[in-house]
């Protein structure tokens, strides 16, 4: 459910939301670290109704949720990290 991507693309998020989404309605979370053409960290949430939203990384709820997911994944499977080579 938690994915970290390193990409050479520019920022993916045009606008960000702080609105709470309970984990039960989240399909997966994609984290795009700052850099490689985008000056800010981005968090993209895929919801179970097939819609996608960019979430403000400063939103308290997403920070809490990612902490829970990190703890959970460290006790089971490692968080998948997908690295794209920068040309």
């Amino acid at each position: 459910v938690l994915e970290v991507y390193y990409t050479s693309l520019r920022c993916r998020c045009v606008q960000e939301s702080s609105v709470f989404i309970p984990r039960r309605f989240i399909d997966r979370i994609q984290i795009l670290p700052r850099g490689n053409g985008c000056p800010r960290k981005e968090i993209i949430v895929w919801k179970k109704n097939k819609s996608i939203v960019c979430v403000d990384p400063q939103a308290e709820w997403i920070q809490r949720m990612m902490e829970v997911l990190r703890k959970r994944s460290s006790s089971t499977l490692p968080v998948p990290v997908f690295k794209r080579k920068i040309p």
Partner: antibody, heavy 123, light 106 residues
Amino acid sequence: EVQLVESGGGLVQPGGSLRLSCAASGFTFSSYAMSWVRQAPGKGLEWVATISEGGSDAYYPDNVKGRFTISRDNAKNSLYLQMNSLRAEDTAVYYCARDYYGSGYEESPMDYWGQGTLVTVSS
Amino acid sequence: DIQMTQSPSSLSASVGDRVTITCKASQDINKYIAWYQQKPGKAPKLLIHYTSTLQPGVPSRFSGSGSGTDFTFTISSLQPEDFATYYCLQYDNLYTFGGGTKLEIK
């Protein structure tokens, strides 16, 4: 005091449609997501639909997806369930329930429920 | 989809008895389980959420425990008003209710 009052149930033929309503009071309706849960006669509880506090997001289980539509009117403190292409297996008491607090970050489940309205699908 | 297997489906007990109901999830649901009480002709009432957190006003004789896939709901000393049907609900991944446990007077 939180109150949820369902209405709109009744007898409908297979293939027919029905619209259920739920009037909410005693809390800030626009701050909470809302859900519908049903219970077939003598059976257990089954989740039917959930809508976010602002009404922009809706979620359904596969067995009602495409047939049922949940909606809300925050100005009227009202929740709705439009049910189309009804089948005999949709016969149940339908409850509306208050769901998570949308302005927070707590993973709370449905806490307050109405008394339900009976929907009977039969020819 | 997550399946919730609740057992037993029915249970006979006496006032003062200690009663335990279990729910097993088909996959890890962390601690995202709730327990409801339902009396005939009435709406379900939330007793416990997040495995063990009691709702305000719910007597302390009700308790819950577990994590991952195995969860337990306990009534430490049955009171006459406790005879009802109890349901578990997982809310880690959408919603799934257990099949219910009907608690009857012996």
